[in-house]
Interface confidence: low
Amino acid sequence: QEEDLPRPSISAEPGTVIPLGSHVTFVCRGPVGVQTFRLERDSRSTYNDTEDVSQASPSESEARFRIDSVREGNAGLYRCIYYKPPKWSEQSDYLELLVKESSGGPDSPDTEPGSSAGPTQRPSDNSHNEHAPASQGLKAEHLY
């Protein structure tokens, strides 16, 4: 008998409010044994698959999808789904990504032409993070 697959979860590091031009990493989590994680966009048949899956804990696996330079078009709803042979899971809850066009803080005026808000905090590895694997996963640039 096939096991019931738990729903995946989705989160974003460092957050869901991202300055224009900064980076964001979507983190999809599921049970151990996941072969493929898929990050899906809302209202479009667009997605990104990765088999770069790491074990985040004894009972959890994880994949990371990074966007190096967030644009206005990246704003929207995202969700995860995974493939654990022989079947696909349900989708995760939606996560909404907000893109802020500002140069000094969420409430500051729009960025001047030619300038770009800086990238968000970017831990380049996770050796001090017990919840995350060493792998940073694949860039999600072709998702869009």
Epitope: S22, V27, Q121
Partner: antibody, heavy 115, light 110 residues
Framework: EQSVEESGGRLVTPGTPLTLTCTAS????????MIWVRQAPGEGLEWIGD??????ATYYASWAKGRFTISKTSTTVDLKITSPTTEDTATYFC??????????WGPGTLVTVSS | ELDLTQTPASVEVAVGGTVTIKCQAS??????LSWYQQKPGQPPKLLIY???TMASGVPSRFSGSGSGTQFTLTISDLECADAATYYC????????????FGGGTEVVVK
Amino acid sequence: EQSVEESGGRLVTPGTPLTLTCTASGFSLSSYAMIWVRQAPGEGLEWIGDIYAGGGATYYASWAKGRFTISKTSTTVDLKITSPTTEDTATYFCARAYGSGYDLWGPGTLVTVSS
Amino acid sequence: ELDLTQTPASVEVAVGGTVTIKCQASQSISSYLSWYQQKPGQPPKLLIYYASTMASGVPSRFSGSGSGTQFTLTISDLECADAATYYCQQGDSRSNVDNIFGGGTEVVVK
């Protein structure tokens, strides 16, 4: 208006656990990474650790691992000093991540560890 | 281990002058560097992030530059109100890091 404020600082004896709380106003903690920093009297800024939005991933300074624990609720970010020593006497700040830096800082809360 | 070295530790500059503070990273941090101003009894104030992007409300007399391992904060047309301690901060690696802040530079305005 957006702000953060630390609380919980007080005089404690060595070894007595202490939890500091960072409370956010005007924005959602679920959307931002937050940092804890301390500053001993007359000294520079010392990073303790930070906690990320979403999954709540935590990162600690190498010297702080095991000595401090950062956690969050929907409205607060907490810093637990597990077993304070006199060297932990300092003003403790929390701040919100923005860009490669931290744009919104609390006024700080003073922790004094003395027997 | 990634650390930041700030120079000088202290500098005295006349009103109207220019001060340059340097921050050197022990390994490349791309442009993930920020600068802060701190006055006694106050929390740090973000001046510059992403090496050269000015934070909201910061006077144009403050400018940041650099990438990789070498970064500079320049304050021109110095005013008395600029007397403070300035810190750099890296926003790149969190692995085996003792501190993400530089040691600070005290700016004395005479």
